[in-house]
């Protein structure tokens, strides 16, 4: 069962799924100037059995100008470098969570993929929230959201997270911190987790190697 709506929006926070439940679907979206090949899949599907899960179907983009030319699926190194979508294989990915039974890892990028990924989550999916750069997390409880089924309808639990405007970044679990935590501050205060459905997170490496994770809104 697909989750209705989006996960809750938290001011100055963004969300990420660390692993995707079987049944999750990912749109095959292409960047501007490219389109999905006519015979290509509309979605990728997380599928599998109790021991192994993987993504079915491959997304393929072709130039809008040359409609019948299929672009290669594997991105070139320089294209991978330019992509901003956070991937599960990055240092911020806790291996144990990605290896959960019945869950898929972040799918690898495909050539000329759009910069935003659009997921269709299923009941039981958990997402984690973090404050955007320049905001600090104040926890009242779990900074996560779960899609639950109640009385035949789905709902996302409300993450207990407030992001306050102090110039301090917070990280997803397992992600290296761009700077040391201020002395005396508990670790839990500088990491913030939360959950949402349609996941659109992007990462950008600044020249200073400071990592900035944020969601991109449609413009």
């Amino acid at each position: 069962e697909l989750c209705d709506d989006d996960p809750p929006e938290i001011p100055h926070a963004t969300f990420k799924a660390m692993a995707y439940k079987e049944g999750t679907m990912l749109n095959c979206e292409c960047k501007r100037g490219f389109r999905r090949i006519k015979s290509g899949s509309l979605y990728m599907l997380c599928t599998g059995n109790s021991s192994h899960s993987s993504w079915d179907n491959q997304c393929q983009c072709t130039s809008s100008a040359t409609r019948n030319t299929t672009k290669q699926v594997t991105p070139q190194p320089e294209e991978q470098k330019e992509r901003k979508t956070t991937e599960m294989q990055s240092p911020m990915q806790p291996v144990d969570q990605a290896s959960l039974p019945g869950h898929c890892r972040e799918p690898p990028p495909w050539e000329n993929e759009a910069t935003e990924r659009i997921y269709h989550f299923v009941v039981g999916q958990m997402v984690y929230y973090q404050c955007v750069q320049g905001y600090r997390a104040l926890h009242r409880g779990p900074a996560e959201s779960v899609c639950k089924m109640t009385h035949g309808k789905t709902r996302w639990t409300q993450p207990q997270l407030i992001c306050t405007g102090e110039m301090e970044t917070s990280q997803f679990p397992g992600e290296e911190k761009p700077q040391a935590s201020p002395e005396g501050r508990p670790e839990s205060e500088t990491s913030c987790l939360v959950t949402t459905t349609d996941f659109q997170i992007q990462t950008e490496m600044a020249a200073t190697m400071e990592t900035s994770i944020f969601t991109t809104e449609y413009q």
């Epitope: 697909l2 709506d5 989006d6 679907m25 749109n27 659009i118 459905t197 349609d198």
Partner: nanobody, 126 residues
Amino acid sequence: QVQLQESGGGLVQPGGSLRLSCAASGITFNDHTMAWFRQAPGKEREFVAARDWSDIITRYASSVKGRFTISRDNAGNTGFLQMNSLRPEDTAVYYCAAREGGVVAGVRSGAPYDYWGQGTQVTVSS
């Protein structure tokens, strides 16, 4: 030139039903995802429902799930929104939208839709 034309709106009493239609010209619905959005006075545009042409994914906003049904007649290049058990809070202008890719739903889901109709007014009042 692509055109989407909504029809079927009107005034209905609470608990009543309406069936909205969306006629497309200039594109073929059999390779486009179709969606409905609505906008109430003084409020932001809100996602209502979407369905891709291959019927892989159909999504509804939780506020309408179980009451509204999105359907399509690809051969006739027409989409529909059957609205039952209407409530005063359903009052809005309803827009039909289409895009080449898969379903996009949720809060900020309007922008990825390439084509839009002019809208049809639905008023639920006693």
